[in-house]
């Protein structure tokens, strides 16, 4: 299982190794170094993968990660059972689908072993960490002489997400996008005959059942038109 | 070096309302997970409101539906809107902070945060 471990995106107040909590003084206040962000993504509603930078302990440390869900059925606290490892180090947790409840405020809780007081409790909104697969299956088709309309399937519910498409020709340097809602179709209204199209596709879940920010990777592009463009020197840049 | 400063504390009778602010200076909250926390005397902080810097925001059980949280970027200040106040508010509320780099994270575990103000006190009289 290859897994892809989140860094932090260069936010300076995160680079200290340790701090002094300032905390009020009536409080149990200890200095005590900060564990890393859990950071969670759900794909495709299949399985979920929570991680942190393991990196970023002082010296290597088997964290242990327990969950729950809040007010639900679901809140009895349980432990990871099936841990991601980085260099033999804990570095997240995989949940498989019957364990992901995407409704429910989901809690995670990071815990140093070595020193149980050393841990830090997240909450989180899967519904709001959900990205699908890619498209598949795109095909296009003509309405008219002059009008293309481009096809996708998704491997969910489709009214659940919204879609990106972009297109451009041989002779384009960038790419134009439309946003698609649910219906998971786009139609091209005037096409020329003479350059070759090139079609893609990334879908994102969001508004109507999450509020995702994260897109699915792009789809496979798809290509309509004429072959022959001998003085296009953007076709190797699609076909790569 | 962030510096947060409550205001809006008080004494205020059962089934009222108060608004608590709470001011940072030294550096924009905008990427900052932040809390509200309260300590009643005897008692173990807890947390009130917390909230993710991309907008999720979590409420503890006993006051979901009477308090709400709001930011204001602009400003670097964020509040606390307590309505219908119950003897059982009574409490010191402290304001908190924490950098994170997701914009998915919310701690309601206090020693998770780096920054807080010194308190306020808010007082709900039956």
């Known amino acids: 299982l290859n897994t892809t471990i989140l860094t932090p995106n260069g936010n300076e107040d995160t680079t200290a190794d340790f701090f002094l909590t300032t905390m009020p003084t009536d409080s149990l206040s200890v200095s005590t170094l900060p564990l890393p962000e859990v950071q969670c993504f759900v794909f495709n509603v299949e399985y979920m993968n929570c991680t942190w930078n393991s990196s970023s302990e002082p010296q290597p440390t088997n964290l242990t990660l327990h969950y729950w869900y809040k007010n639900s059925d679901n809140d009895k606290v349980q432990k990871c059972s099936h841990y991601l490892f980085s260099e033999e180090i804990t570095s997240g947790c995989q949940l498989q689908k019957k364990e992901i409840h995407l409704y429910q405020t989901f809690v995670v809780q990071l815990q140093d072993p070595r020193e149980p007081r050393r841990q830090a409790t997240q909450m989180l909104k899967l519904q709001n960490l959900v990205i699908p697969w890619a498209p598949e299956n795109l095909t296009l088709h003509k309405l008219s002489e002059s009008q293309l309309e481009l096809n996708w399937n998704n491997r969910f519910l489709n009214h659940c997400l919204e879609h990106l498409v972009q297109y451009r020709t041989d002779w384009d340097h960038s790419w134009t996008e439309q946003s698609v809602d649910y219906r998971h179709k786009f139609s091209l209204p005037s096409v020329d005959g003479q350059k070759r199209y090139t079609f893609r596709v990334r879908s994102r879940f969001n508004p109507l059942c999450g509020s995702a920010q994260h897109w699915s990777e792009w789809s496979h592009p798809i290509h309509w038109g004429s072959n022959t463009s001998k003085e296009n020197p953007f076709l190797f840049a699609l076909e790569a | 070096e962030v510096q947060l400063v409550e205001s809006g504390g008080g004494l205020v009778q059962a089934g009222g309302s108060l608004r608590l602010s709470c001011a940072a200076s030294?550096?924009?909250?905008?990427?900052?997970?932040m809390g509200w926390f309260r300590q009643a005397p005897g008692k173990e902080r807890e947390y009130v409101a917390i909230?993710?810097?991309?907008?999720?925001?979590f409420y503890a059980d006993s006051v979901e539906g009477r308090f709400t949280f709001s930011r204001d970027n602009a400003k670097n200040e964020v509040y606390l809107q307590m309505n219908s106040l119950q003897p059982e508010d009574t409490a010191v509320y402290y304001c908190?902070?924490?950098?994170?780099?997701?914009?998915?994270?919310?701690?309601?575990?206090?020693?998770?945060?780096?920054?807080w103000g010194q308190g306020t006190q808010v007082t709900v009289s039956s």
């Open positions: 908190a902070g924490a950098p994170t780099s997701f914009a998915t994270t919310a701690y309601s575990s206090s020693n998770s945060y780096r920054y």
């Open positions: 030294g550096r924009t909250l905008s990427r900052y997970a």
């Open positions: 909230d993710s810097w991309g907008g999720d925001t």
